[in-house]
């Protein structure tokens, strides 16, 4: 599997899409997991509804949501209020019994908010009635890793 890079801005929402063969993955629930190290396990973050028929319903785990268009063949993951610690390697998975097929490997990169002037001391916090999510357009940039690029920095 090639790795696709999705870039998002800190504090904003990042939407990750994972296309798949809807015929092949018919009846199968999906999951989003985070890769722990280059050869480590993929730790489940969130999975689609326990009933495959209800996979279109958005499920949340903390600030991460998942929803599945089972006929169109697109799994969508939303990372809300993106933070630097969200950066890393993830997988979209299709669950088949006790097995999990990788649909896409995803590298999430978190960019600094260009409107963030914390250095200047003029921090802005949303008021209680304001939605932080609504203040920013959902946005993602994606690309495939070039040959030779590695998603994990080499460990010394």
């Amino acid at each position: 599997h090639n790795t696709t890079v999705f870039q998002g801005v800190a504090g904003q929402s990042l939407q990750v899409s994972c296309p798949y063969d809807s015929m092949k993955h018919w009846g199968r629930r999906k999951a989003w997991c985070r890769q722990l190290g280059e050869k480590g396990p993929c730790q489940r973050v969130v999975s689609t509804h326990n009933l495959w028929l209800l996979s279109f319903l958005r499920r949340w785990n903390g600030s991460t949501a998942i929803t599945d268009d089972t006929l169109g063949g697109t799994l969508t993951i939303t990372l809300r209020n993106l933070q630097p610690h969200d950066a890393g390697l993830y997988q979209c998975q299709s669950l088949h019994g006790s097995e999990a097929d990788t649909l896409r490997k995803v590298l999430v990169e978190v960019l600094a908010d260009p409107l963030d002037h914390r250095d200047a001391g003029d921090l802005w916090f949303p008021g209680e009635s304001e939605s932080f999510e609504d203040a920013h357009v959902e946005h993602s940039i994606s690309r495939s890793l070039l040959e030779g690029e590695i998603p994990f920095p080499p460990t010394s």
Epitope: M23, K24, W26, L53
Partner: antibody, heavy 119, light 106 residues
Framework: QVQLQESGPGLVKPSGTLSLTCAVS?????????WSWVRQPPGKGLEWIGE???????NYNPSLKSRVTISVDKSKNQFSLKLSSVTAADTAVYYC????????????WGQGTTVTVSS | DIQMTQSPSSLSASVGDRVTITCQAS??????LNWYQQKPGKAPKLLIY???NLATGVPSRFSGSGSGTDFTFTISSLQPEDIATYYC????????FGGGTKVEIK
């Protein structure tokens, strides 16, 4: 249009392995579809055995899973069924079929082949 | 496993009669249900897919309806060539068939 043809021994001994092949003609086994096996014991209803995708991904009937193996040979445009440790209860007409799920159901069937389990 | 309960198991009707067969799923299957016709000694033939869509080349006297757990298959005007056993089948999970309904002419 796509046609399917089952072949294999009509008689299998108890505790032996039933082996059948389904030849696909008029189309490619690499088409977007699941290739299925369904059986029908004499005078009874239809029972789904399992299915295979062209990339060799499989789904099996939970009640038969421990005894069933379905494989695909793309070079020969065919798929096969193996059912081990057979008993008289496995005597049935065995059908192969193409299943396009939401996009058209089990729309193509073979004519069926009778397999008898007897010593 | 999702169980499919079909009724009646057999029926006898006259040519021209309206014939109705029902199928009940043990859990919600949306519209992921097919209907097949099987004549003696022959392979099943797909008539209706996705609960209500007529398969290619199937006469319009055949129809299907329903969603969720309750489904109906109808022959609007029974013809002699419709003598067969009819099966419903769900495909949300591992496919399962109803027990069949044998249709005979009075």
């Amino acid at each position: 249009q796509v046609q399917l043809q089952e072949s294999g021994p009509g008689l299998v001994k108890p505790s032996g392995t039933l082996s059948l092949t389904c030849a696909v003609s008029g189309g490619s086994i690499s088409d977007s579809a699941w290739w299925s096996w369904v059986r029908q014991p004499p005078g009874k209803g239809l029972e789904w055995i399992g299915e295979i995708y062209h990339d060799a991904d499989t789904n099996y009937n939970p009640s038969l899973k421990s005894r069933v193996t379905i494989s695909v040979d793309k070079s020969k445009n065919q798929f096969s069924l193996k059912l081990s440790s057979v008993t008289a209860a496995d005597t049935a007409v065995y059908y192969c079929a193409r299943d396009t799920k939401y996009w058209g159901g089990m729309d193509v069937w073979g004519q069926g082949t009778t397999v008898t389990v007897s010593s | 496993d999702i169980q499919m309960t079909q009724s009646p198991s057999s029926l006898s009707a006259s040519v021209g009669d309206r014939v109705t067969i029902t199928c009940q799923a043990s859990q919600d299957i949306s519209n992921y249900l097919n209907w097949y016709q099987q004549k003696p000694g022959k392979a099943p033939k797909l008539l209706i897919y996705d609960a209500s869509n007529l398969a290619t080349g199937v006469p319009s006297r055949f129809s299907g309806s329903g969603s969720g757990t309750d489904f109906t298959f109808t022959i609007s005007s029974l013809q002699p060539e419709d003598i067969a056993t009819y099966y419903c089948q769900q495909y949300v999970e591992a496919p399962t068939f109803g027990g069949g309904t044998k249709v005979e002419i009075k």
